[in-house]
Structures are given as C-alpha cells and as structure tokens.
Interface confidence: low
C-alpha cells in the first residue's frame, strides 16, 4: 500500500494527505514526481511557435516565428531579426562598430573591413556598416633598378610616367 509520495514518477502529482500518485491534468507537467502540483504548460502563440510540445513530464519549448529571433533564457522574448549593418548580441541588435560590417539580413556577425594594403592595393570605395570596402587594382611597386623618366607631353603641366 502506497503511503508516501516519494515513489511517484515524473508526470504525476501527489498530496501528502492522500498520498496517491495521480496523472497531471491536461496541459500541465511535472518533471519531478511527488510534487503537490503540476506546472502549467507554456503556450507558444503570437510571435512564438512550438519547438517542442508540452508533455506530462516536460514543458513546451518555444521558438520565434520567421523574421524574429529569441532573446533571454528559454526564449522568453522575440525580437525582429537584425538588419544588415547590425549583429545579434545578448542585448539584442547592435550596429556594427566603425571598421566592421555585416551584409546579411537576420544573421551573421560584424566582420572587419578588408585591409586593401595587405594585398598591395588601394581603397577604391570606403566601407560602411553594411558593405565591405572595395579595393582598387594593385598599386605598382618599383624595384631599386627601375629608371623613371618624366617627359613633358601635350602642353604645359602634362606629364607621362614611363617605366623603362
């Protein structure tokens, strides 16, 4: 004869004055047996949708509908997906800091602009928070033995660079 709630399984509740394990009622759960009450299942509605249904032994898990992402532990809030030029942090969407960009919608992190000079190239178009810099063609580099002669051409002020 059961005279204790200690042996009750998850998915049940039990009252000390009547120590019988009883199934949790509809839309409630208990992950630990023998508790006096079952917990009300989380409802995923509005900006939330079900990731995992509620059962007698575990709560429902929600995720955000398309175009939104979760914030907080166990996805307590939904926030609109980040725009290009932003990245998702624990505090929500944050604008990329100077010198970084993110060209993706809803995902991705801010990445540093390309360093054109590492490839020996000049900056053709400066970067923004949404777009990387555009590098120009490689800058011509001259060796010590190269002779440069500047010759007048086509009138005053006109010069052409000739590499011999």
């Amino acid at each position: 004869v059961q005279n204790s709630c200690d042996n009750c399984q998850p998915g049940t509740f039990c009252r000390k004055y009547n120590p019988v394990c009883k199934s949790c009622p509809p839309s409630t759960f208990s992950s630990i047996g023998g508790q006096p009450n079952c917990n009300i299942c989380r409802v995923c509605a509005g900006y939330f949708r079900f990731k995992k249904f509620c059962s007698s032994t575990h709560n429902a898990e929600c995720e955000c509908i398309e175009g939104f992402h979760c914030l907080g532990p166990q996805c307590t809030r939904c926030e609109k997906d980040c725009r290009p030029g932003q990245e998702l942090t624990k505090q929500g969407c944050k604008t990329c800091s100077l010198g970084t960009f993110n060209d993706q919608n809803g995902t991705g992190v801010c990445r540093p602009w390309t360093n054109c000079s590492l490839d020996g190239r000049s900056v053709l178009k400066t970067g923004t928070t949404e777009k990387d810099v555009v590098c120009g063609p490689p800058v011509v580099s001259f060796s010590p033995s190269t002779t440069i002669s500047v010759t007048p051409e086509g009138g005053p002020g006109g010069h052409s660079l000739q590499v011999l």
């Epitope: 998915g11 509809p26 839309s27 759960f29 299942c41 409802v43 509605a45 509005g46 949708r49 079900f50 990731k51 995992k52 249904f53 509620c54 059962s55 007698s56 032994t57 575990h58 429902a60």
Partner: antibody, heavy 119, light 107 residues
C-alpha cells in the same frame, strides 16, 4: 460531449481551391488548438498544421506551407482550412482534430472530409 | 522530421489471442507517443498517450509500453470490436509524425 463536425465531401478541378470547415462543440474552443491532418492510402496520416483558436495564429508543417491556410471564426466556434492550387495528389480525407490531452496528441477527431481533385 | 516505422503492416489474430504492434522512432522521443485505433470508414480514436497511459473509456485490455526509440501496443485478449487499423504518433518534436499503420484482422 466534445464534437467536431466537418463539412461535406468536395469535388474540385485541378488549379482550383476548396475551403472545408470544422465546427467545435461541447468544450471551450479557445482552450485547445485545432489541428488538421491529411490521410491517403499511399502516404498514411500526415500532419498539416494547427491554429491557435485563441489568438488566431497558425503554424504549418513545412510540407504544407503555401498549400493550406488555416483560419478560425470564434463567434461560430468554427475552424476552416483552405486548400489552394489543387492537384490530384491533394485528393485525400482531411480531418480536424483537437489538440490532445497533452499538446501534441489528438484526443477528438472530426468525421473527415473527402476531397477529390479531378478534371 | 522524426520517422515512425510501424510493424507489422498487417496481422491476423484469433479471438482471445494477445497481439503486439511495434513502433520504432528514428530518434529518442522520451515517451511522447500516442496510439490510435481507426475502424473502417471512421476517424481515428485516441487510445493511449505518454506511451503507456490509457485515455478515459479505453478498455484495460489495451496497454502501451516502451522507451527511447522503441514502443509497443499490446491487446490482451482480442475482441471482435478490435478489428481495425492502429497508428502510433510521436509528439516529441514538431511536426507530429505518424506510423504507417497496422491492419489488425480477426482470423
């Protein structure tokens, strides 16, 4: 007692749409989700999606996005499913079912609606 | 989606015989499994939820068991009214998915 009364059989032409209904009685409509399930001989039972009868929000199985549209009229305790751009593969029996004893199970089912798509 | 593999596809049993139907999930479903009975030309009826819990009004000759990925439905003492199709269904992950069904006939 809980009852889900569905509309009558539908014969539809390819490319057309049908809208079938499910009238709930014997319980508080907004306390449960209403789910829709497709049954064919070849594919068996396939879950289409549910409508949250309280908020009117719906959620679809990826396979049926764009095919089914779920709505609810709380004043008449009736849920609807519209099937669009019908093709012969949409020929099936469609059931509405109440979100079950625990969400995710289906404790009461309508009698089903036979939809036949044929030219 | 979680795949539910049901076996056998069909089964003949004599009255009074005990029969078992198996359901195998493609991943662990933590007992989030239901069984349904569907008689010819009718809609499915809810029999068992949470793998082993009988829905109110379901005869005690029906029982469910299992864990992890493997589950079974047992009918202890086949009755004429048990002739039907039986389906398992997982609700561990969205979308819910069903087994392909077992046709149970009287021998």
């Amino acid at each position: 007692q809980v009852q889900l009364q569905q509309s009558g059989a539908e014969l539809a032409k390819p490319g057309s749409s049908v809208k079938i209904s499910c009238k709930a009685s014997g319980y508080t409509l907004t306390s449960y989700y209403l789910n829709w399930i497709k049954q064919t001989t070849g594919q068996g039972l396939e879950y289409i999606g549910y409508i949250d009868t309280g908020s009117g929000g719906s959620h679809y199985n990826e396979k049926f996005k764009g095919k089914a549209t779920l709505t609810v009229d709380k004043s008449s305790s009736t849920a609807f499913m519209q099937l669009s751009s019908l093709t012969p593969v949409d020929s099936a029996v469609y059931y509405c079912a109440r979100g079950g004893y625990y969400d995710g199970f289906f404790d009461y089912w309508g009698q089903g609606v036979m939809v036949t798509v044929s030219s | 989606d979680i795949q539910m593999t049901q076996s056998p596809a069909s089964l003949s049993a004599s009255l009074g015989e005990t029969v078992s139907i198996e359901c195998l999930a493609s991943e662990g479903i933590s007992n989030d499994l239901a069984w349904y009975q569907q008689k010819s030309g009718k809609s499915p009826q809810f029999l068992i939820y949470a793998a082993s819990r009988l829905q109110d009004g379901v005869p005690s000759r029906f029982s469910g068991s299992g864990s992890g990925t493997r589950y079974s439905l047992k009918i202890s003492g086949m009755q004429p009214e048990d002739e039907a199709d039986y389906f398992c269904q997982q609700s561990y992950k969205y979308p819910p998915t069903f087994g392909s069904g077992t046709k149970l006939e009287i021998k």
